[in-house]
């Protein structure tokens, strides 16, 4: 008995209010007077007073229009008490379901939607999705069921039905072929969302479809023929700037040019790079060109893009005729660095070598020569023939000017061109050793005790090279052999000097003659300080004083 089925109340009721909904009735009213009340949100708690019950009659009343989008269902409890306040029934659940009216239009989530699609795509390609919401119910009614449609397309090129929209999902897709960014870079679609699954209220928004660039246009040379003039021998020289036009999106990989020399550069003399801003091809010399060898080059340059073409496109080729301009080139010594072996100490006026230069130019130019750098002043050079002769003594052992037996001279060749040009060569004289130095002992001063003297070992040096050095031989002269002995060691590179008789403390000259393997003899005087002492000594002790 004490049960009420769920009560359905349409939202936005026009009233009049209070409006009767249902009558609560307990069968206990046969026995006693019953008073009714309701509790719950919408009755005695917020939102208060939306519903009321007449205490004596049990009539449940609605006091105001309902809004399903605010509250879709009210859960109240009905109570029945007797006159003395005692509960005569358990609280009864009263469900009030607010039924939907189509009182909301769809609303797009954005005023403007933005999407993009690659030009040239096939029909069926998805572009973007638009969304509209409707606060009305879409489960039990169609009030909130939104259907999407495209109202208009601008521009209408190539025709007015380039796109379609899925009526339920709002997915915009390409429906026709012919999207061409170079003709229409952007479409503006006026889109509609209509509730009642397409039969109700409509709202509009804008969908902007950007057509993205595909590499469907080849870069084209403009012009296709070029003539350029380049001085010979110039490296890194800008020969020509090649200009291309490309209808694809500027500064994109589909627009940026890539240049390739297809022919005419057998010697790999040229290189081509792309200018980052202008997109021009900058043709430069990688190596110097030689007018005398080839005075004209015809290059064939092909242009493509950084991005691959999306369809088969003819590539554009440019022809560049490069005229090489003659330049007065410097004479070149042959070889640039010349090594000549010459004996040291050759007589003055003796020829050393002939060192000449060749002029790359075709004209028979006169070349004159001179020495540019001759640190020791040992040489002269004939200005006409390039003959180098000795004017000083070539000394291999001169450590100031000679390094590792090599004496370096720089020579100059000058042509009679206008203006004249010069070239330099390096003459490396390898000086052959002559036995022009005798052996020398080191040290040349010794200190020795006159009692139990220690043998003095002297090193032998010779500025010459082998075989004009060791083994050395030693001999004492001028009566030095009375008191001294001199012996060369087994290796033949040291001499041992010994005191063989007592000498009183004093300083003596020991005359020592050393000869090398080539019998070059050198007399050296050794200053010997003899001390009154035993064995080893470095300096003579002072006189002894008793006390």
């Amino acid at each position: 008995d004490w049960v009420v089925a769920p009560i359905s109340v349409p939202e936005n009721g026009k009233g009049p209010f209070p409006q009767r909904l249902n009558q609560l009735k307990s069968n206990k009213d046969r026995d006693t007077k019953i008073f009714y009340s309701i509790t719950g949100p919408g009755a005695d708690s917020p939102p208060e007073g939306v519903f009321a019950v007449e205490k004596e009659t049990g009539w449940l009343l609605l006091n105001k229009p309902l809004d399903r989008e605010e509250i879709a269902k009210y859960e109240l409890f009905g109570h029945a008490v007797s006159e003395n306040g005692a509960s005569v029934e358990d609280p009864m659940n009263i469900s009030i379901i607010v039924t939907d009216q189509n009182d909301h239009k769809p609303k797009f989530t954005q005023d403007t939607f933005r999407g993009s699609v690659l030009e040239g795509v096939l029909p069926g390609t998805s572009v973007m999705q638009v969304t509209a919401t409707d606060e009305d119910d879409a489960i039990y009614t169609y009030n909130g069921v939104v259907a999407y449609s495209i109202h208009s397309q601008e521009p209408k090129d190539p025709h007015d039905l380039m796109f379609t929209i899925h009526r339920s999902t709002g997915t915009i897709s390409v429906i026709s072929s012919g999207l061409d960014r170079e003709k229409v870079p952007e479409y503006t679609l006026t889109i509609q969302a209509t509730d009642m699954d397409g039969d109700g209220s409509t709202t509009t928004a804008v969908a902007v479809v950007e057509i993205l660039d595909a590499n469907d246009n080849a870069p084209m040379f403009d012009p296709q023929k070029y003539e350029a003039h380049v001085p010979e021998n110039a490296v890194g020289h800008e020969v020509q700037r090649l200009t291309v036009t490309d209808l694809d999106a500027p500064n994109s990989p589909a627009w940026r040019a890539t240049y390739l020399i297809m022919g005419g550069d057998d010697g790999d003399h040229f290189t081509i790079t792309t200018h980052p801003e202008s997109n021009q091809g900058i043709l430069t010399t990688r190596k110097g060109l030689d007018f005398e060898a080839k005075n004209q080059h015809t290059l064939y340059v092909e242009v493509t893009n950084e991005a691959p073409f999306v369809l088969k496109l003819p590539t554009s080729t440019a022809t560049i005729v490069v005229h090489v301009e003659d330049v007065n080139e410097a004479p070149v010594f042959v070889p640039p660095s010349k090594v000549v072996e010459v004996q040291e100490g050759i007589p003055t006026g003796e020829p050393v070598c002939v060192y000449t230069a060749e002029d790359p130019d075709k004209e028979n130019q006169k070349i004159s020569y001179r020495i540019l750098r001759d640190p020791a002043g040992w040489l002269a050079m004939d200005p006409d023939s390039g003959q180098v002769t000795a004017v000083g003594t070539l000394d291999r052992e001169d450590e100031q000017f000679v390094r590792n037996n090599i004496y370096e001279v720089m020579v100059l060749a000058m042509d009679n061109g206008s203006p004249p040009t010069t070239g330099t060569g390096t003459l490396l004289l390898t000086l052959i050793d002559v036995n022009d130095h005798g052996p020398v002992p080191e040290p040349r001063q010794i200190t020795i005790c006159n009692q139990s003297p220690v043998r003095q070992v002297l090193n032998i040096t010779d500025k010459d090279l082998s075989p004009h050095t060791s083994p050395f031989q030693a001999q004492l002269t001028d009566d030095s052999d009375i008191y001294w002995t001199a012996e060369v060691n087994e290796e033949g590179d040291t001499v041992v000097l010994s005191l063989k008789k007592f000498l009183k403390q004093d300083t003596y000259d020991v005359h020592l003659s050393l000869s090398d393997h080539g019998n070059k003899e050198q007399l050296t005087v050794i200053r010997a300080t003899v001390c009154d002492c035993h064995g080893h000594v470095e300096t003579c002790p002072g006189p002894w004083k008793g006390g």
């Epitope: 026009k14 009233g15 009049p16 209010f17 209070p18 009767r20 009558q23 008073f35 009340s37 208060e48 007073g49 939306v50 009321a52 019950v53 007449e54 205490k55 004596e56 009659t57 009539w59 449940l60 009343l61 006091n63 105001k64």
Partner: antibody, heavy 119, light 107 residues
Framework: EVQLVEESGGDLVKPGGSLKLSCAAS????????MSWVRQTPDKRLEWVAT????????YYPDSVKGRFTISRDNAKNTLYLQMSSLKSEDTAMYYC???????????WGQGTTVTVSS | ELQMTQSPSSLSASLGERVSLTCRAS??????LNWLQQKPDGTIKRLIY???SLDSGVPKRFSGSRSGSDYSLTISSLESEDFGDYYC?????????FGAGTKLEIK
């Protein structure tokens, strides 16, 4: 049990003036019933003036009085009120208060109070 | 707004006679119609609510009925205390509107 309602506050008032009517209720649980004001013009026609919900949260008016009249209630005092302002000569009438009962309006009526709007 | 057309505007009848008063609604109001009685002293009482439900204390000779948009109050046998003015009032549409009244007099 006998339900009684009794109006008071009727008076002679000049056009543009204001007046507040009261209605005292007894014999029923006033706070659980919707209440209305109804007026009877001199030509005997009845016209609904205002309704208020039992808790006093919601009120309704016809266009003829909207913005000029305000219905209110004090459930603690079992009293209904009608505040009238910007009065016009066509507001001259006998004013009755009436209760809802069985969810239906105009169940129990008072004896009425006279309002005369005249210069 | 919804119009209630009440007829007749006046009626003379004899005691014991059966009389019917009618109200016609200009729009659908369902069963949301009451009948009121106003005595010569001005007191008003509700006789019938919801087209046909009798208020407590109202004699059973009073009855209400509906036929489409026509609503009737019938007094099966007139008694002396039944004379006065009768009004219908609808509460199925806002604003609530009353009939112009029927004056019931003794013949």
């Amino acid at each position: 049990e006998v339900q009684l309602v009794e109006e008071s506050g009727g008076d002679l008032v000049k056009p543009g003036g204001s007046l507040k009517l009261s209605c005292a209720a007894s014999g029923f649980t006033f706070s659980t019933y919707g209440m209305s004001w109804v007026r009877q013009t001199p030509d005997k026609r009845l016209e609904w003036v205002a309704t208020i919900s039992s808790g006093g949260h919601y009120s309704y008016y016809p266009d003829s009085v909207k913005g000029r009249f305000t219905i209110s209630r004090d459930n603690a005092k079992n009293t209904l009120y009608l505040q009238m302002s910007s009065l016009k000569s066509e507001d001259t009438a006998m004013y009755y208060c009436a209760s809802y009962y069985y969810g239906s309006p105009f169940a129990y009526w008072g004896q009425g109070t006279t309002v005369t709007v005249s210069s | 707004e919804l119009q209630m057309t009440q007829s007749p505007s006046s009626l003379s009848a004899s005691l014991g006679e059966r009389v019917s008063l009618t109200c016609r609604a200009s729009q659908d109001i369902g069963s949301s119609l009451n009948w009121l009685q106003q005595k010569p002293d001005g007191t008003i009482k509700r006789l019938i609510y919801d087209t046909s439900s009798l208020d407590s204390g109202v004699p059973k000779r009073f009855s209400g009925s509906r036929s489409g948009s026509d609503y009737s109050l019938t007094i099966s046998s007139l008694e002396s205390e039944d004379f006065g003015d009768y009004y219908c009032v609808q509460y199925g549409s806002s604003p609530l509107t009353f009939g112009a009244g029927t004056k019931l007099e003794i013949k």
